[in-house]
Amino acid sequence: FGISGKHFITVTTFTSAGNIGEDGTLSCTFEPDIKLNGIVIQWLKEGIKGLVHEFKEGKDDLSQQHEMFRGRTAVFADQVVVGNASLRLKNVQLTDAGTYTCYIRTSKGKGNANLEYKTGAFSMPEINVDYNASSESLRCEAPRWFPQPTVAWASQVDQGANFSEVSNTSFELNSENVTMKVVSVLYNVTINNTYSCMIENDIAKATGDIKVTDSEVKRRSQLQLLNS
């Protein structure tokens, strides 16, 4: 990696997570430089010979790209000039997890930064009232998780209560034999209460809320990626 710049430039990366089977982004920014023809971006992965991706002279140079990344990487070419060296990674695989380095050279100087990329599966939970059950119950389903997450229930009225005795959680392997469908049923629920189903692994935490009243059912769900 030849260096022509005289100074070190600031390069910033963000630990991020990839959802297997979907597209992901490895984030990297640097001090902007209007001289595009002088910008070189190199992405490397620890333990891998060859490059993940190289961008120089305004275009991709994939002559040294490792075969496991062939056809799966792209930079945001129109954003490079404003200091965006982030890498788009198509069809994220479990094996994409690891330590990546973002190397930058511009007419102002050079710099690099590492990032930890975690891979797994995570999805939004959906809670529904299970009218088929003998007593009124709630069914929380999330289609794709990996590694196997923990599932916990909470209630607005019974704060701090342990629902493990009145809930049942199962994990069903999906057809690709990696990710799993999460199903958790909470029994003996009471009306006019808000219940939360929380699914968490070391990559993400997802929460589904449901409020059941006499007249309506209100739902809300959110997903948060965990940085560490």
Epitope: E31, P32, I34, K35, L36, N37, E57, G58, K59, A77, D78, Q79, V80, V81, V82, G83, N84
Partner: antibody, heavy 117, light 107 residues
């Protein structure tokens, strides 16, 4: 949506300094990384890039004008400015401010500046 | 400086015609070529960026192609509102430079 508006005197005397301000509305000038730019167009002619500035203060000028140009930014006022010194009749043009990434996607409507005694 | 040469400098066409404008750079600019439309008394409007990406809100009859030194702007079916002057611009190496323009007039 984001809008840019040029302002400044429409008439400048030869050898004096042309001063224009671009006010950004509908968004913060420092909310993201952009090249806040000036472009000019003499009557009946083509477009010429004058220069650009980042909110960090880094400036980039057209070498043909560099000795006479100063571009500055005032984030507190959401404005950036152009100063062009020692003007001549050849500097008579419509002056545009614009926002750029690697393309100029938002433009002001332009202001005509005539250099004449 | 990178010189941008547009051709033709003007052309006459009718509504419904397919119109092609070319732009040549004096050296390779990869895909950092943008196209603008300008109507009299108005500011230029971005049509195409990165040689072929259509700017949001621009009709799909506009398309761009090319890389390196040779680029093309195509209007597949000219509409009355398309009569204007078109400029190419490179953002590969400062100073950013524009082509001389192509004026599209009514035949």
């Amino acid at each position: 949506q984001l809008q840019l508006q040029e302002s400044g005197p429409g008439l400048v005397k030869p050898s004096e300094t042309l001063s224009l301000t671009c006010t950004v509305s509908g968004g913060s000038i420092s909310s993201s990384v952009y090249y806040w730019s000036w472009i000019r167009q003499p009557p009946g002619k083509g477009l010429e890039w004058i220069g650009s500035i980042l909110v960090s203060g880094s400036t980039y000028y057209n070498p043909s004008l560099k000795s006479r140009v100063t571009i500055s930014v005032d984030t507190s006022k959401n404005q950036f400015s152009l100063k062009l010194s020692s003007v001549t009749a050849a500097d008579t043009a419509v002056y545009y401010c614009a926002r750029a990434v690697s393309f100029l996607d938002v433009w002001g409507q332009g202001t005509m500046v005539i250099v004449s005694s | 400086d990178i010189q941008m040469t547009q051709s033709p400098s003007s052309l006459s066409a009718s509504v419904g015609d397919r119109v092609t404008i070319t732009c040549r750079a004096s050296q390779s600019i990869s895909s950092y070529l943008n196209w603008y439309q300008q109507k009299p008394g108005k500011a230029p409007k971005l049509l195409i960026y990165g040689a072929s990406s259509l700017q949001s809100g621009v009709p799909s009859r506009f398309s761009g192609s090319g890389s390196g030194t040779d680029f093309t702007l195509t209007i597949s079916s000219l509409q009355p509102e398309d009569f204007a002057t078109y400029y190419c611009q490179q953002s590969y190496d400062p100073p950013w430079t524009f082509g001389g323009g192509t004026k599209v007039e009514i035949k």
